[in-house]
Interface confidence: low
């Protein structure tokens, strides 16, 4: 499919001008290559009319130009003094006319309306309001006032001062007679439809002395604004419909076959399933304007979008609308990253987030998409050292691997973590990406003790058991803090006995804390990685207390300390059962503690996005 994009249809009137913008991927080659505008012939060829290399056909001499804007990947063709002969099929493109790097454009030039003398022209957008003013003389002040529409050869009464309203205008028209000082009456038509366009005649009086005024009403269908975005990227539709619809329900819909427009999202709470997890309807301003953000753009998102206002929250005749034609460029600069990541309860996930590598110094964010109302995405963590309180000890945002990708690690997973998450930066807003976390059946691969208590001044050894599948991975221990996880020295204690059907390649790697101090209290993670790419992690909270008896603590021998809701493994260490981690500030022995995350986050269900790009929690 050609990555060139422009307007499919351009309509104008004889004598007017048009400006046609064509978009291309702004690669170095594309920015400098030839741009052209050609007319398609009946037998298939395409005759150049104007190009960026200076050529201008005699047909266009003195009335056309082509301007390239390499910095934003567009070029613009301006054509003036249009005639009906200019109607036809054209291409805007790059390189050689026959190469296929082009976009088809249909140009339709129509004859200007043949208007009667003294005709007032009203040009109004679809769905808006028009006021037709009708002057009259004093002698007709007390006589019947009326508005007719010319249908074919015959005038058809639309409204009059005796109270008649044509059924086609019911509920959206009124006739106002100004105060006695002004010799003027007005007809106001709301929620204009395309079918309202045409010639009108307003009249005061019915005899030969009546006053008449001709009006031509042109109802404009909004020209779609062209939007060119990268696959996997993000688009924002800004919709400003005016204060008169500030209190009317708003919607964004996507045109399907014919005139159907399927609601994507509206302010009444409707959202199309295909956009679950990747759409936000941003707050309405007092003037009724709003915006819709869609992330994780897919090929099938391309098409015509309309935003509008109607009490039903969907497109109806007479809705004021704004239009966009979205083109999704498959030659995307945004790298592929998994759209679904799977983890098990008690386990972990490592999510790779792409960002614009030109903005390495930008602040990185990760937020949790919530579907309630119109959608929101509260931040959970950022690269400046802020972590939402409920996620302390189990969430970290790492700048690694860098060069256009950062990593988010979330461990101690529960079913409540299933959902959609957005990767963001405070830089290029087009690089918002979405990932869905799914919680699947299974056991965590890494095995660590439950929360551990260390004694001041003594030595503590904490084991982490790695199965054979991680034999080729680098194994590490680190201490979590709100800016990341600082690596700590660890010892390889040889093969682990914690895994059934696992050979000598399984590993027991221990963290040793010598001469424990108060500063050692906190969350510790063991994990695996390959270079700068992170895999699974497991977390242990180490509490520090005053000395009770002499000696060092080797947690692997703490069989007797096992709490009732933990299961003791043969190797003599504790594994946390698939439960939410308790508040670390309450020690492991104090069991009757509610899960603070449950209270704060409420219940969220996972919705399958149907994505084929899936990733397990333990591999990259």
């Amino acid at each position: 499919k050609s990555p060139i994009f422009g307007p499919e249809e351009v309509n104008s009137v004889e004598g007017n001008s048009v400006s046609i913008t064509c978009y291309y991927p702004p690669t170095s080659v594309n920015r400098h290559t030839r741009k052209y505008w050609c007319r398609q012939g009946a037998r298939g060829g395409c005759i150049t009319l104007i190009s960026s290399e200076g050529y201008v056909s005699s047909k266009y001499a003195g009335r056309a130009n082509l301007t390239n804007f390499p910095e934003n990947g567009t070029f613009v063709v301006n054509i003036a003094q249009l005639s009906q002969d200019d109607s036809g099929r054209y291409k805007c493109g790059l390189g050689i006319n026959s190469r296929g790097l082009s976009f088809d454009v249909s140009l339709e030039v129509s004859q200007g309306p043949g208007l009667l003398n003294d005709t007032k022209v009203y040009t109004v957008d679809l769905g808006r309001t028009v006021t037709i003013n009708c002057p009259f003389k004093t002698e007709n002040a007390q006589k019947r006032k009326s508005l007719y529409k010319q249908i074919g050869l015959y005038p058809v009464l639309v409204i009059d001062s005796s109270g008649y309203v044509n059924p086609n205008y019911t509920g959206r028209i009124r006739l106002d007679i100004q105060g006695t000082g002004q010799l003027l009456f007005s007809v106001v038509i709301n929620q204009l439809r395309l079918s309202d366009a045409g010639q009108y005649l307003c009249q005061a009086g019915d005899d030969s002395n009546s006053n008449k005024k001709n009006a031509d009403l042109q109802v404009l269908k909004p020209e779609p604004e062209l939007v060119y975005e990268d696959l996997r990227g993000s688009v924002t539709f800004h919709c400003a419909l005016g204060p008169e619809v500030a209190n009317v329900a708003k919607f964004l819909c996507r045109q399907s076959s014919g005139e159907n427009c399927d609601v994507v999202v509206n302010t009444l709470g409707k959202r199309a399933p295909a956009f679950e997890g990747r759409i936000l309807l941003n707050p309405q301003d007092k003037d009724g304007s709003f915006s819709v953000v869609i992330t994780g753009l897919r090929k099938e998102d391309a098409g015509r979008y309309l935003c509008g206002a109607h009490s039903d929250g969907q497109l109806q005749e007479g809705s004021p609308i704004q239009a966009w034609q979205l083109f999704v460029n498959e030659e995307s600069t945004i790298p592929r990253s998994p759209t679904v990541v799977k983890g098990v309860a008690g386990g972990s996930v490592a999510v790779l987030c792409p960002y614009n590598r030109k903005e390495s110094k930008s602040i990185k964010y990760w937020c949790l998409w919530e579907g309630a109302q119109n959608g929101r995405c509260p931040l959970l963590v950022d690269s400046e050292g802020w972590v939402k309180a409920q996620y302390e000890g189990r969430l970290s945002l790492l700048e690694e691997p860098g060069n256009g990708t950062f990593t988010v690690i979330l461990n101690q997973l529960t079913s409540r973590d299933a959902g959609f998450y957005w990767c963001l930066t405070n830089g290029d807003t087009l690089w918002r990406t979405t990932v869905e976390i799914k919680i699947i059946e299974g056991e965590p691969n890494l095995k660590v003790p439950g929360n551990v208590t260390a004694v001041l001044g003594e030595t503590l050894k904490v084991p982490c058991h790695f199965p054979c599948k991680f034999s080729s991975y680098e194994k590490y221990w680190c201490k979590w803090n709100n800016t990341g996880c600082q690596a700590l020295p660890s010892q390889d204690e040889g093969p682990s006995k914690a895994f059934v059907n696992c050979d000598e390649n399984s590993r027991l790697v221990s963290l040793t804390l010598n001469l424990v101090t108060r500063a050692d209290e906190g969350w510790y993670w063991c994990g695996v990685k390959q270079g700068h790419f992170y895999g699974e992690t497991a977390a242990v909270y180490v509490a520090v207390e005053e000395r009770k008896a002499a000696g060092s603590r080797d947690v692997s021998l703490a069989k007797a300390d096992a709490a009732p809701d933990e299961k003791v493994l043969d190797s003599g260490f504790r594994e946390i059962e698939n439960k939410a981690i308790q508040d670390p500030r309450l020690f492991a022995e104090e069991k009757a503690v509610a899960d603070t995350r449950d209270q704060a986050d409420g219940s969220r269900a996972s919705v399958d996005s149907g994505s084929s790009e899936e990733q397990g929690g333990s591999s990259r």
Partner: nanobody, 128 residues
Framework: EVQLVESGGGQVQAGGSLRLSCVAS???????????RAWFRQAPGKERELVSA????????YYVDSVKGRFTVSTDDAGDTMYLQMNSLEPEDTAVYYC??????????????????WGQGTQVTVSS
């Protein structure tokens, strides 16, 4: 927990100016990190109303109609302090002014209940 502290309130004649400041208690905390920051006001016996709001990294700034052209919101270079410059003050501007911030990336800006962090408020009195 982050706390916001306002200053700059006071008494002024109609037509005068005031500049309100809002500083975050933690130096590590920057307004640039926030999804939205705002100034609200509450006149006696009335509901708290939004005066101005800026979404995350200043992409969109809103002003209530009654202050448009008179009030301007800004942030210092470091992002530690938010300001509300109030010019051509009118008696109807008399109220307690609050700065607020939140970390949610979207939802209704006009609803004060969606804001996580609040200042204690500073009184502005405009006499005719």
């Amino acid at each position: 927990e982050v706390q916001l502290v306002e200053s700059g309130g006071g008494q002024v004649q109609a037509g005068g100016s005031l500049r309100l400041s809002c500083v975050a208690s933690e130096r590590t905390f920057s307004y640039y990190d926030l999804a939205a920051r705002a100034w609200f006001r509450q006149a006696p016996g009335k509901e708290r109303e939004l005066v101005s709001a800026s979404t995350w990294n200043g992409g969109y700034t809103y002003y209530v109609d009654s202050v448009k052209g008179r009030f301007t919101v800004s942030t210092d270079d470091a992002g530690d302090t938010m300001y509300l410059q109030m010019n051509s003050l009118e008696p109807e501007d008399t109220a307690v002014y609050y700065c607020a911030a939140r970390r949610a990336y979207s939802s209704d800006l006009h609803d004060y209940r969606t804001f996580d962090y609040w200042g204690q408020g500073t009184q502005v009195t405009v006499s005719s």
